[in-house]
């Protein structure tokens, strides 16, 4: 079988129940693979720790929006 079929995917068992300060966050990625038990957002903190969060929670959505704005290239 091709490697891609058996390649593991990163998933989340559960979500943090603590809101993370946006100042501690460096980036995020969405987890939408059908191989995972649930959809999730994985935040990477400024110290490179990865934390699973619930994409349905408002603070998670707000944090993603904030990170998106941070990474947008300023218009010249």
């Amino acid at each position: 079988q091709p490697d891609a079929i058996n390649a593991p995917v990163t998933c989340c068992y559960n979500f943090t129940n603590r809101k993370i300060s946006v100042q501690r966050l460096a980036s995020y990625r969405r987890i939408t693979s059908s191989k995972c038990p649930k959809e999730a957002v994985i935040f990477k903190t400024i110290v490179a720790k990865e934390i699973c969060a619930d994409p349905k929670q408002k603070w998670v959505q707000d944090s993603m929006d904030h990170l998106d704005k941070q990474t947008q290239t300023p218009k010249t």
């Epitope: 593991p8 989340c12 068992y13 995972c36 990865e50």
Partner: nanobody
Framework: EVQLVESGGGLVQAGGSLRLSCAAS????????IAWFRQAPGKEREVVSC????????YYADSVKGRFTISSDNAKNTVFLQMNSLKPEDTAVYYC???????????????????WGQGTQVTVSS
Amino acid sequence: EVQLVESGGGLVQAGGSLRLSCAASGFTFDDYAIAWFRQAPGKEREVVSCISSSDGSTYYADSVKGRFTISSDNAKNTVFLQMNSLKPEDTAVYYCAAVSNCPRDSDYIPYLHYWWGQGTQVTVSS
């Protein structure tokens, strides 16, 4: 070919017992943990129990602690989930999966998910 095959599901009355089996083939059993998940209609999959094949360490969700017991027969590449004192809320499709590690205290840390089985239906009637 990698395969995870669940069996042992069925219909049981509340208070009864079932023993689920997850037979694995096509990969080196000792390199993975095996987790049992369940999914009830209209709900997300949740992890129920997990066992690390390498050291035998186990995990149980709070909702099944004291009622479910996970074990493995490494020689037969099979993991068992003994389910006692079943409740109607245990009704779900139960799936086993090969994963990188079982949940820890910090179970909001990501893990690697390799393969799912097809699932076995467990129905607990009141």
